[in-house]
Structure formats: structure tokens, C-alpha cells
Amino acid sequence: EVEKTACPSGKKAREIDESLIFYKKWELEACVDAALLATQMDRVNAIPFTYEQLDVLKHKLDELYPQGYPESVIQHLGYLFLKMSPEDIRKWNVTSLETLKALLEVNKGHEMSPQVATLIDRFVKGRGQLDKDTLDTLTAFYPGYLCSLSPEELSSVPPSSIWAVRPQDLDTCDPRQLDVLYPKARLAFQNMNGSEYFVKIQSFLGGAPTEDLKALSQQNVSMDLATFMKLRTDAVLPLTVAEVQKLLGPHVEGLKAEERHRPVRDWILRQRQDDLDTLGLGLQGGIPNGYLVLDLSMQEALS
């Protein structure tokens, strides 16, 4: 706590300006009026205050606004935002996307901090849903943002917002998240023609069911192996060799390199060996000729 001392003669701050960087902490505390600071917050970011001096400025704002800062102050916090704790941020009511952008800019290039996560949570909860503009903003600053949300949180993303999602935004998503996002993407892109549709839906296919993969195999999409390897195993298993060949097109040759990895390994185990042989890739491990496959609750091969 900074002790209360009288401001030395001639040092009372008439405005927030660069001369304040030469003030000791106690001088800042004594000579800078909190109300003046609040009205001139936009100037703080242009002044190279030390971290210790920023502590004092924050302390002054905390005293002035014990219930939480107004948005007019929050919008101009600049790098003073880095001094805020999640507890501070939970007191805020941030409604403007411009305010959100201004604060995310301060943290740009760094990992998402607990402060930023709290800020985003407060903002999204205040809006009620992740609208397109918000999602656009968040994924621009944090490509992995979408994949940091729980499936429950993702359910509040309207299909229209999916247009803002770039392939790299989904890089760290797990199957549970893609299960939620895929139907939204399918709805969002439903009016596009075949090739354009595939380009857009490709990143979301980790959540696609078998019937959609079968439909895609009829459209000459030439899915690359990287996308195929991210498909749900349970969605790939029922596909026939012919369907996989059509789905992958010229990329089918890549199956050989992935034959020991899921979902390719599990898919091979479900195919007849003579069907696999038609691919001419030397894939081994299929069901030997003359065996009957019964699709029971658990997989069995009976002679």
C-alpha cells in the first residue's frame, strides 16, 4: 500500500503527460488526481510508465471505482490492462467490440492469459452468444480460441458465425468439439456448389458422420490424407474400399504410409483383403477371402 503523503510543492499534475514518468511512486500517489487520470486514460498508453508506476495508477483507479471500472475507462486502459487480475475483470461490464479489440491488442502475440480469458468470457456472456463479429475478432487474435471452448459453449455459436472460422482456428479442436461445429458448418455452407462447399467444410469434417462422407465420395472431392486422418474412426469404418478410393481420388496412394495409424488401420481390418488388393497399394490386414463378417455389437471374424 502506498503511504499517503502530501504532494511536494510544484508537482501537482495538471494533466496526464510524459513528465509523470519521472515521479516516484509516492509522488504519483500524492500528486495525480484519480478523476483526472480517469478522464485522460487515453494518454496513459502513449507514456512509457514503469510497471511500478502502473501499479500506482491502477491503485488510484481501484479507489475511484471500487465496484469496477466504467467502459469509458476500460476502453483506454492500454497496457495497464496487463496489471488487471481476473477478479478485477469480473467486475466489468464490457459491451463494445471496440473495447474488446483494444484490450486484445495489448496482449497480442502472447498466449491467452487468465485475464484475457476472463475478459472474453465476460464479453461473450454479456452478448448471449458468439456472434460472427465477435468470433471474427477473437479468432484473429487467438486462432486456437474456438478449440478452447467446451462443446456446451460451442453450442451457442450461431451457424452464421462459422463463416469467420479459418482452417487454422480448428487445428487444436478435438472430436467432441468438431461434433458440435460440423452440423453448424454444414448448415452455414449448404447453398454452396460441390467444390466450393468441400473447400469450406473440409476443416470441419472431423465431426462428419458416415452418411456425409459417403455423399462426399460421390462428388470427386479428392480429400487429402491429412484431412482423412482427422475423420472420426466410427465414421470411416463403414466406408467401402470403393467409397474411400472415390473420396481420396489421387491421394489414395497415401493410405500405404498410414496403414499402421488410426483410422486407416482400423478401416483396413474391416475390409475384405481382395477389395483392398484392387487398390494395388499392398495394404495388408484385411479380412481373408472366404471369411464371413457379422456386424455384431463387437467385431468378430468367424470362419
Epitope: 511536494p8 510544484g10 508537482k11 503527460d17 510524459e18 513528465s19 509523470l20 514518468i21 519521472f22 515521479y23 516516484k24 511512486k25 509522488e27 502513449a46 507514456i47 512509457p48 514503469t50 511500478e52 508506476q53
Partner: antibody
Amino acid sequence: QVQLVQSGAEVKKPGASVKVSCKASGYTFTGYYIHWVRQAPGQCLEWMGWINPNSGGTNYAQKFQGRVTMTRDTSISTAYMELSRLRSDDTAVYYCARVEAVAGREYYYFSGMDVWGQGTTVTVSS
Amino acid sequence: SYELTQPPSVSVSPGQTASITCSGEKLGDKYVYWYQQKPGQSPVLVIYQSTKRPSGVPERFSGSNSGNTATLTISGTQAMDEADYYCQAYHASTAVFGCGTKLTVL
């Protein structure tokens, strides 16, 4: 070598303005503050204010508030000091000086005025 | 406003030690800078941060600062040291000069 070169002597009438220039060379102009100091004939050194050439930020001595304006042109590494509403007691030699701002843990502090201009004599006379 | 006080003049014989004082409230808490100015010339920094000497300044110049007083000491004073000496400190972001001491080498 590091030097500050000031503009030549000026003679002005009371009420007029004078603008003195200070051209830096031999160092990074935006890396140091420029302070302005004046000295009336036979008198003490009197600090007038400073400008940060990097940000354009200024701070003026109370005595000169409203009459002095400090500016800079980074493209030509030059700082300027303009004093308006001149009076006869503004007759003095005006100096610019280079000062480093040192970042301490808690606050910044100025170091010494390690390089000075040669001075510009300003005479105010009717 | 903050003020620094210096004696108007100090006299010293060649080879002797000259001491020039500068006083101000809690001056010991601040860094003090000393400048030498010869007639018709610009000031030259001879001591910075109270005790440090810039390169090129002779070793006979030294400084100290404690309490309310800073002192510039010139040991083995030479005729060429005859000049006006100004102390200076910063009051936050503003510079304050003493009114100078004329050092006469007898």
C-alpha cells in the same frame, strides 16, 4: 563526434517571437531528451523545459508556460524552441542540451546535460 | 518551488583544495550534477549522479552528497579551473540550477 549546433544570434522587438533551432549530429536524435536553458547577462542558468524528440512530449517550467513552445523535426534531427511575447528581460543566451532519461526499476530519472549547444544570443530591444 | 543555494564566490590558492557547496531540502535524496562554465563558453558537465566523473574530466574533480548538502571538491586546484560552477538537480521532471559559484584561483 556528438554535437548540437544552434542557429545564429537574433535581435527582436518587444512583443515579437523568436524561434531558435538546435541540430543534433553524431548520435541517435530520438534517443535523448533535449532541454533548453537560458542565461541572461551576468545571471544564473535558468531551465526552460524539455522535449522528447521520440514522442514529441514536452514539459515547460512554470515561468514560461503559455509563452514557450518546443517542437522537433526528426527527419532533420532538429529541435526548436519558440518564445513569444518577448520582453527586454528575455535578452539572454539560449542553450539546448542533450539529456538521457534512465529507466530505473520504479521510475525514470534524467542524467546530466552532457552535451550543450554553443548558445544563441537573443537580444530584445525596441 | 524547489531551490538550490550556492555561495556566490570561493577563492583558493593554486595547488590547494577548493570546496563548493550546494544546499537544498533533502538534496541527499537526489542526484546532483555539476557544470563548469568559463566566460563566453557553454557549460560543461564535470560531475554527474553526485559522485561520478565523465570521461575527459580530470581526476582532481570529485563530488559528494548527503543530507541537505552536495559538495564539489577540486583538489590541487589549477589556474585553468577558474570558472563559474553550477550545481543542478531534478525535482521530478523539472531541472533546477543553483545560481552559480565563481571560483577564483589566487
